[in-house]
């Protein structure tokens, strides 16, 4: 593992920009620079080694001023001003605006629907496996195992509410204690943040857009990971979440409430239920060791059923096994007893695509996974395109200023807390933190929202999803009310604790710095984004899961040296950047390590070799495949969607030449125009939103 990518011989200097050095990034964009900046700001030619080569297109130019890659781009208005238009032009422009709004809402609708179907697809592919994770008896004694199970299950079912409801049903049926459930809830919090990270991957086409989008998405990941890193040991030591929530649950005499309002589902369900409908109870039944459930399909076939309670006669090994001594007999051959059963009569089939196909869950899941990712990607690209054409000039300035500007002094500090409330409110409305944060991601990418503003919105989203859970808990039946409410409150207080740790003091806003660092790395080495996703959401949890199954000794034996090395590297990194003089000369930089341990460059070469075959066939028949291709091969031409990567070799040869700053080609339309790919006249017909 590289202690920090691309550190080379660089001496710590806070004034200079170092690729990947999150610690040296300004935490907020310089507002004074922001207003006048255009997309043609150029990077300096001096000290080339400190410049990140962020643009895939090698455009030789003479840079004039240093540019912060985290400053929001000015989306220039290339259209005719409103005042200069005639009546016909104004009417045309008005209808264009209405059309764009309808298209935007339409794509947004299908974007949310595809997220719902993506969740269903994941449940079909990995739901049963997720259920089996829960049936592991070691969860009770090992909080770390509980944590990774929470992560893995939520990643597999793409829904924290599903994994939380499984936990609730297990607690209410005494298969799990609240104490054992808390780490699982923490893990579910981490797992749910994978969705917007996947969404961010869809914006891989433009480096600077991808940098912002990926950082904006992973700020959620880092907040959750850091919160767990601090709060899980605190919880294990003090059980503060368990105690606080128990006191709350016991002090209030809750009446069963109404069901939590399904606000967004009301709109999306009519469409998504035509695609697929799932029987979510199956995963819960598997988690509760129901053997019959393992052979059941998650795909719901019958939507209208009649349930009739009746007594049936069942054979038992001997009369000692009778359910009731008075209801026991033999027919001379077998021993019988009466059992109360609920007989389900199927009346009407569900109305969805897969109802009559009788395909295995894995097949249905795979089909839906591919289709939902394609729709998700397509919608996202279209949303970004429409927003890109709408949010230009004055409109962009107004929106960006509204969203990103703080309250006047002395109330500036309140802005973030208002953003937290807005995030919580919006998540409560859409009933899903995944949907809210996923919708936020492209906005961060195109530069409408800063990461500094996205951070409190994301934190608010974390709170919003727990308030939904609390409402759902209050609507639970009597036997599940206590446990579900306590778990929902644990989730709530865990997020509150996390916010108190990583938000109030600007210095403690580590998730922003870490996300920006990861954004920088991923912008340069785009494969690293996928690598990060696999490592943090699959490999690390699976490794911990495997080691936990092997026992405490193995877990400690492997874990302690790994943790020790990480702490050592972090301490050394901190000393190198803050006070290098206290260190021996050899330890003042990472040069004492082999290149593959301190830089991603050698790894990049390996990845490039593997993806070389893709590079030569980097065909851009459509934007979607083009994006996937860009992610794999870092191809300079495919992201502009030209025919193929013919000039690949020349592009690779010219990689060490100074390049234009990343913000230069933020807006796709402008970048194409600047390169002569789009005739100038094309953009003149663009209509600025009113």
């Amino acid at each position: 593992m590289a202690p920090w990518p691309e550190l080379g011989d660089a001496q710590p200097n806070p004034d200079k920009y170092l690729e990947g050095a999150a610690g040296q990034q300004p935490t907020a964009p310089d507002k004074s620079k922001e207003t006048n900046k255009t997309d043609n700001t150029e990077a300096p030619v001096t000290k080339i080694e400190l410049l990140p080569s962020y643009s895939t297109a090698t455009l030789i130019d003479e840079p004039t001023e240093v540019d912060d890659p985290w400053n929001l781009p000015t989306l220039q208005d290339s259209g005719i001003k409103w005042s200069e238009r005639d009546t016909k032009g104004k009417i045309l422009c008005f209808f264009q605006g209405i059309g764009r709004l309808i298209l935007l809402l339409g794509f947004l609708y299908f974007f949310v629907c595809s997220l719902d179907i993506l969740s269903s697809a994941f449940q079909l592919v990995g739901g049963k496996m997720a259920g089996q994770f829960f049936s592991n008896s070691s969860i009770m004694s090992n909080p770390l195992l509980g944590l990774v199970i929470g992560v893995l299950v939520t990643v597999l079912v793409q829904s924290s509410s599903t994994s939380t409801s499984i936990v609730v049903s297990m607690v209410s049926s005494s298969l799990l204690t609240v104490r054992a459930a808390i780490p699982i809830i923490m893990g579910a919090n981490i797992g749910t943040s994978i969705t917007n990270t996947i969404v961010a991957l869809m914006q891989v086409g433009d480096r600077s857009e991808f940098r912002r989008a990926f950082a904006g998405a992973t700020v959620h990941d880092f907040f959750n990971w850091l919160s767990v890193l601090v709060l899980l040991p605190v919880e294990v030591a003090t059980h503060y979440l368990e105690i606080i929530t128990q006191l709350i649950v016991e002090s209030f005499h809750f009446k069963n409430g109404e069901d939590a309002p399904d606000l967004l589902k009301v709109i999306t369900k009519p469409f998504t239920k035509l695609i697929v409908q799932l029987d979510k109870k199956v995963i819960s039944q598997i988690a509760m060791n129901d053997e019959k459930a393992k052979n059941k399909s998650l795909v719901k076939i019958w939507c209208k059923t009649f349930t009739n309670k009746t007594q049936i006669n069942v054979t038992v090994p001997s009369t000692a096994n009778c359910t009731s001594p008075s209801l026991c007999w033999t027919d001379g051959i077998q021993n019988w007893t009466m059992k109360n059963v609920t007989y389900k009569e199927n009346i009407a089939k569900c109305q969805h695509i897969f109802v009559n196909f009788h395909l295995p869950d894995l097949a249905v899941g795979t089909i839906l996974l591919i289709l939902s990712l394609l729709v998700l990607c397509g919608c996202l690209i279209m949303i970004v395109k429409i927003l890109g054409s709408v949010l230009k000039g004055q409109v962009a300035t107004v929106i960006k200023k509204t969203i990103n500007t703080d309250f006047p002094f002395p109330f500036a500090w309140l802005t973030g807390y208002l953003a937290i409330l807005v995030g919580a409110g919006m998540t409560f409305i859409v009933q899903s933190s995944s949907v809210f944060t996923s919708a936020l991601t492209p906005l961060i990418g195109i530069g409408v929202i800063t990461i500094e503003r996205a951070y409190p919105l994301t934190l608010g989203s974390n709170i919003g999803t727990t308030t939904t859970a609390i409402l759902a808990a209050l609507a639970s039946p009597g036997n599940a009310l206590r446990s579900s409410l306590q778990i929902a409150l644990c989730h709530f207080f865990f997020n509150i604790s996390g916010i108190l740790l990583w938000y109030p003091i600007p210095f403690t806003r580590l998730p922003i710095r870490m996300a920006k660092g990861l954004g920088n790395i991923s912008a340069k080495y785009r494969w690293f984004a996928v690598f990060y996703l696999i490592i943090f959401f699959f490999l690390i949890p699976l490794t911990v899961f495997g080691l936990s199954l092997a026992g405490w000794r193995v877990l400690v034996g492997v874990g302690v040296p790994v943790v020790f090395i990480i702490i050592l590297v972090l301490c050394l990194r901190l000393l190198q950047s803050r006070c290098p003089r206290v260190l021996p000369k050899k330890l003042q930089n990472w040069n004492f390590l082999p290149l593959w341990m301190r830089s991603l460059k050698p790894w990049d070469a390996v990845v490039s070799k593997f993806t070389g075959c893709f590079q030569m066939r980097c065909c851009c028949c459509c934007r979607v495949c083009c994006r996937a291709c860009c992610l794999l091969c870092d191809c300079p031409k495919c992201c502009r969607c030209s025919k193929c990567c013919e000039d690949l070799e020349e592009a690779q040869e010219g990689q060490d030449v100074p390049v234009k700053a990343p913000e230069t080609f933020d807006n796709i339309t402008i970048s194409r125009e600047a390169q002569g790919e789009v005739p100038a006249s094309d953009s003149k017909t663009e209509c600025t939103a009113l």
């Epitope: 006669n313 009369t319 033999t330 027919d331 051959i333």
Partner: antibody, heavy 120, light 107 residues
């Protein structure tokens, strides 16, 4: 209507075997258990054993095990009881009776009985 | 094996009289008891099953009661055609066992 028609009376020598048949009609043979009960002259009823024709699962009273064999022919809806190593105390009227499988209604229909006499 | 003891072994009474036959099981059999009627020279006929449920076609004058170890067959008003031997049978555990029988006669 429901009928269980048994084979005619038999006179056997000690040590020999006897095979009594019970032909059924008027009901689904495979949905019932066929039991065999005997009654020695002037005595009570004694259960011998039973067979589930559907899967040929049998059970016998301990003192008849090894001597009695119950079989069923689904094609003709007929049940058979073969008793070997006959002794004089095996002289009795042998009845077949049906019992609805998986139900607690007991032996609701009986055959007319087959008299087996064992004498030298 | 569970022993079923019937009493009396025989009884003689007048037409229209109430007749009560008891059956005692050597251990708890719940309600898994059946009563059969066997007329001279005929095969047995099911009267009562599950201790108190009348079989189809059985006259209402026949009723059964009891649970556990003590069971009763009652003929509320004895009719001439009721002359027969009555057997109780337990079907709680295998092997199935019958009572010794109660012979009912009319004076």
């Amino acid at each position: 209507q429901v009928q269980l028609v048994q084979s005619g009376a038999e006179v056997k020598k000690p040590g020999s075997s006897v095979k009594v048949s019970c032909k059924t009609s008027g009901f689904f043979f495979t949905e019932y258990i066929i039991h065999w009960v005997r009654q020695a002259p002037g005595q009570g009823l004694e259960w011998i054993g039973g067979i589930i024709p559907n899967n040929d699962v049998t059970n016998y009273k301990q003192n008849f095990r090894g001597r009695v064999t119950l079989t069923a022919d689904k094609s003709t809806s007929t049940a058979y009881m073969e008793l070997s190593s006959l002794r004089s105390e095996d002289t009795a009227v042998y009845y077949c009776a049906r019992w609805r499988n998986a139900y607690y209604s007991a032996m609701d229909s009986w055959g007319q009985g087959t008299t087996v006499t064992v004498s030298s | 094996d569970i022993q079923m003891t019937q009493s009396p072994s025989s009884l003689s009474t007048s037409v229209g009289d109430r007749v009560t036959i008891t059956c005692t099981a050597s251990q708890d059999v719940g309600t898994a008891v059946a009563w059969y009627q066997q007329k001279p020279g005929k095969s047995p006929k099911l009267l009562i099953y599950w201790a108190s449920t009348r079989h189809t076609g059985v006259p209402e004058r026949f009723s059964g009661s009891g649970s556990g170890t003590d069971f009763t067959l009652t003929i509320s008003s004895l009719q001439p055609e009721d002359v027969a031997t009555y057997f109780c049978q337990q079907y709680r555990t295998s092997p199935l066992t019958f009572g010794g029988g109660t012979k009912v006669e009319i004076k």
